[in-house]
């Protein structure tokens, strides 16, 4: 007869490991008992269990409650056992010793491999600001057995670097993603992807990039100076900028206080019916935690009567 087993049994941490041992005997041969022992190199054999053909399953006190026979129906020539709730410390070499009659004893070894799936963590780097050089955007760490693979999935241009730390029964892998911050990266996803044989699918952790910046400010509303004449209603100036964090706006007048009736509504300065006292230099002040910008414009409210007089003069002059 001969023993059938596996060279390697692979199980995920916490799952049950089936340790196979089947005696394929000749006609009339019987199995008296099957003894299972752990036989790691450099240490003496430690018995896990003994399956007795007549007196049933005997379990070592060290494995009490953790070793069982597979559920029925059972073949009397099958000496397989279940090791419940595999832990990392179970990883190693096991020996199955089958005592038969009349053929005698047979033994076979297998290796139990316990996969420890990683629990990855992503740590964002320091605050990103436009104008910085190459900066750490995020680091991702995953520890498992065997060592997990850590990669990045993103549209953002950057560089990665990885390092690994080996522990007695596992390995921790850390990957860093560096980039040169620019405003176009704002809101872009940066995803850490962790692969491991103990995972049914890759684990993904996504970090949304936030890059602090403040665009140049400009003022809209004076494109057609002819519209800025006495009596005009609904005239307004709008301050244009963008930033992260979103900026706040403040309006002032360089050559004095804001005229009465002028309304400040965030980025917009609204005027009552225009008079000549609305002429002046207006300043839009834009700021966020990152920076501040100013833009100023000169408002010249036209008097249509003066204009028509000038026109007549011009016509007559010609």
């Amino acid at each position: 007869g001969e023993l059938e087993t596996s060279d390697v049994v692979t199980v995920v941490l916490g799952q049950d490991a089936k340790l196979p041992c089947f005696y394929r005997g000749d006609s009339g041969e019987q199995v008296g008992q099957v003894a299972w022992a752990r036989v790691d190199a450099g240490e003496g054999a430690q018995e896990l269990a003994l399956l007795h053909s007549k007196y049933g399953l005997h379990v070592s006190p060290a494995y009490e409650g953790r070793v069982e026979q597979p559920p029925p129906p059972r073949n009397p020539l099958d000496g397989s056992v279940l090791l419940r709730n595999a832990v990392q410390a179970d990883e190693g070499e096991y020996e199955c010793r089958v005592s038969t009659f009349p053929a005698g004893s047979f033994q076979a070894r297998l290796r139990l491999r316990v996969l420890v799936p990683p629990l990855p963590s992503l740590n964002p780097g320091p605050a990103l600001e436009e104008g910085q050089g190459l900066t750490l955007a995020a680091s991702c760490t995953a520890e498992g057995s065997p060592a997990p693979s850590v990669t990045w999935d993103t549209e953002v241009k950057g560089t990665t670097s990885s390092r690994s730390f080996k522990h007695s029964r596992s390995a921790a892998v850390t990957s860093e993603f560096h980039l040169v911050p620019s405003r176009s990266m704002n809101g872009q996803p940066l995803t850490c992807v962790v692969s491991h044989p103990g995972l049914l699918q890759d684990q993904r952790i996504t970090h949304i990039l936030h890059v602090s910046f403040l665009a140049e400010a400009s003022v809209r509303g004076l494109e057609d100076q002819n519209l800025w004449h006495i009596g005009r209603e609904g005239a307004m100036l709008k301050c244009l900028s963008e930033g992260q964090p979103p900026p706040s706006y403040n309006w002032t007048r360089l050559d004095g206080p804001l005229p009465s009736g002028v309304r400040v509504d965030g980025d917009t300065l609204g005027f009552p019916p225009l008079t000549t006292e609305h002429s002046g230099i207006y300043v839009c002040h834009v700021s966020n935690e990152f920076s501040s910008r100013d833009s100023q414009v000169t408002v010249d409210v036209l008097d249509p009567q003066e204009d028509s007089g000038k026109q007549v003069d011009l016509v007559s002059a010609s």
Epitope: A35, E47, L50, H52, H58
Partner: nanobody, 118 residues
Framework: EVQLVESGGGLVQPGGSLRLSCAAS????????MGWFRQAPAKQRELVTS???????RYADSVKGRFTISRDVSKNTVYLQMNSLRAEDTAVYYC????????????WGQGTQVTVSS
């Protein structure tokens, strides 16, 4: 041939403890399992617990958590620690040894009486 001698039996109150010993001599190299059986009056002899050469153990459901079998290979002795004894544990306790060649218990001690009574 294997010779087995038990000791440690006696009278004990319910909830009490006793420790039985079984010393083996003779052809001890041929011993595989060693076990403790018991036989109460007018009942069949039953296997209470057994232990393998490597220290793996098996207990009858009726004694799980109360009885502990152990084996001192250097002294060729097997012990049965009995705690939380009950009246239904009253019986003659026999030590037995199983031969590697036969895979059944073919060597027996003379038995020791255990009585649990108040």
């Amino acid at each position: 041939e294997v010779q087995l001698v038990e000791s440690g039996g006696g009278l004990v109150q319910p909830g009490g403890s006793l420790r039985l010993s079984c010393a083996a001599s003779g052809s001890i190299s041929s011993i595989n399992l060693m076990g403790w059986f018991r036989q109460a009056p007018a009942k069949q002899r039953e296997l209470v617990t057994s232990i393998s050469p490597g220290g793996s153990v098996r207990y009858a459901d009726s004694v799980k958590g109360r009885f502990t079998i152990s084996r001192d290979v250097s002294k060729n002795t097997v012990y049965l620690q009995m705690n939380s004894l009950r009246a239904e544990d009253t019986a003659v306790y026999y030590c037995a040894a199983e031969s590697e060649r036969t895979y059944y218990f073919d060597s027996w001690g003379q038995g020791t009486q255990v009585t649990v009574s108040s």
